[in-house]
């Protein structure tokens, strides 16, 4: 048998979040029923993470010996705490797009350990905001964002922009 | 380690024009508002420019609005100041400062640069 | 323009005692998302300014617990509760409410009695 720090070396983690408890579940992508030391864990799922926090969760199966997989939750800021924004102004709304994603409220995790991911189309943004410029008036475009905090994607949100009439005479 | 450096800091003449850079390293620059904030000979503290994180709004006091332009060039990790019109009350140590949104903080500033408006 | 007074100007300690700087507004600086984006910073000698308080009580990760922030609506106070030597500087209360027309206070200076 191999050890469970083996078999679950690159276990990949995926994080839901409650908007009522305002608490993390973290969901643990493994084929089989997984034990989870300390931490009760239903269905490879660990609930109630606390925003921010770090938590230790020890791995083990009937497949694989000691030593256990120690995992560590990197988990993320609360989801409410970031707002999409179109800060596209009024004046440029014919050609222009711009998207932002706000922080609205401070958090205590590492603000380098984040990611913004914006795809409109074909284009890819590695950024918090993005302006697109020169685009066709009176047509729609969709754009899709995500955010990932230590590259576990945590809140994802698309938005379909209509650019306005082009004026008169163009 | 992250860290902020201003340069460009000089004696001009009234009326004059120049520019500062401040150079980000050790973070995602584009990922941060960045603010110039000064500090007169009396040793008080303005706040003078504002950028978002991807350069598309821009902020100023009434003080400098019309004769200082604050911009970004996210590809070279650096942060300006076109300064023009320049008048002795501009006189100052000007640093940059790093602020995660409008409704965050300045956690990182530079060690700044002064700007000397004498004739 | 939101004015930020601090008092007193220069506060004169002896190590080991508390210290108060005050600062008041000249409106509120409470954002209509209920928030209060006021802020402390401490500028040492020949150093750039640091942040020690966000939202008025909150400390900023490695500041000691004996600097504390309270206040609300336009009065504020920071508080040290024991004066230590490297706390020597100018305190600075700002305001982040009025976005985008922030202001510093004009500085208390913390200083050896």
């Known amino acids: 048998k191999p050890t469970c720090d083996e078999k679950y070396a690159n276990i990949t983690v995926d994080y839901l979040y409650n908007k009522e408890t305002k608490l993390f579940t973290a969901k643990l992508n493994v084929n089989e029923n997984v034990e989870c030391g300390n931490n009760t864990c239903t269905s490879n799922e660990v609930h109630n993470l606390t925003e921010c926090k770090n938590a230790s969760v020890s791995i083990s199966h009937n497949s694989c010996t000691a030593p256990d997989k120690t995992l560590i939750l990197d988990v993320p800021p609360g989801v409410e705490k970031f707002q999409l924004h179109d800060c596209t102004q009024v004046e440029k709304a014919d050609t222009t797009i711009c998207l932002k994603w706000k922080n609205i409220e401070t958090f205590t995790c590492d603000t380098q350990n984040i990611t913004y991911r914006f795809q409109c189309g074909n284009m890819i943004f590695d950024n918090k905001e993005i302006k697109l410029e020169n685009l066709e008036p009176e047509h729609e475009y969709k754009c899709d964002s995500e955010i990932l905090y230590n590259n576990h994607k945590f809140t994802n949100a698309s938005k379909i922009i209509k650019t306005d009439f082009g004026s008169p005479g163009e | 380690e992250v860290q902020l450096v201003e340069s460009g800091g000089d004696l001009v003449k009234p009326g004059g024009s120049l520019k500062l850079s401040c150079a980000a390293s050790?973070?995602?620059?584009?990922?941060?508002?960045m603010s110039w904030v000064r500090q007169t000979p009396e040793k008080r503290l303005e706040w003078v420019a504002y950028?978002?994180?991807?350069?598309?709004?821009?902020y100023y006091p009434d003080t400098v609005k019309g004769r200082f332009t604050i911009s970004r060039d996210n590809a070279k990790n650096t942060l300006y100041l076109q300064m023009s019109s320049l008048k002795s009350e501009d006189t100052a140590m000007y640093y940059c400062?790093?602020?995660?949104?409008?409704?965050?903080?300045?956690?990182?500033w530079g060690a700044g640069t002064t700007v000397t408006v004498s004739s | 323009d939101v004015l930020m007074t601090q008092t007193p100007l220069s506060l004169p300690v002896s190590l080991g005692d508390q210290a108060s700087i005050s600062c008041r507004s000249s409106?509120?600086?409470?954002?209509?998302?209920?928030?209060?984006?006021l802020e402390w910073y401490l500028q040492k000698p020949g150093q750039s300014p640091k942040l020690l308080i966000y939202?008025?009580?909150n400390r900023f990760s490695g500041v000691p617990d004996r600097f504390s922030g309270s206040g609300s609506g336009t009065d504020f106070t920071l508080k040290i509760s024991r004066v230590e030597a490297e706390d020597l500087g100018v305190y600075y209360c700002?305001?982040?409410?009025?976005?985008?027309?922030?202001?510093f206070g004009g500085g208390t200076k913390l200083e050896i009695k």
């Open positions: 400062a790093r602020r995660y949104d409008v409704w965050w903080y300045f956690d990182v």
């Open positions: 050790g973070f995602a620059f584009s990922n941060y508002d």
């Open positions: 950028i978002s994180s991807g350069g598309v709004s821009t």
């Open positions: 409106q509120s600086i409470v954002h209509s998302n209920g928030n209060t984006y």
């Open positions: 939202k008025v009580s």
């Open positions: 700002f305001q982040g409410s009025h976005v985008p027309m922030y202001t």
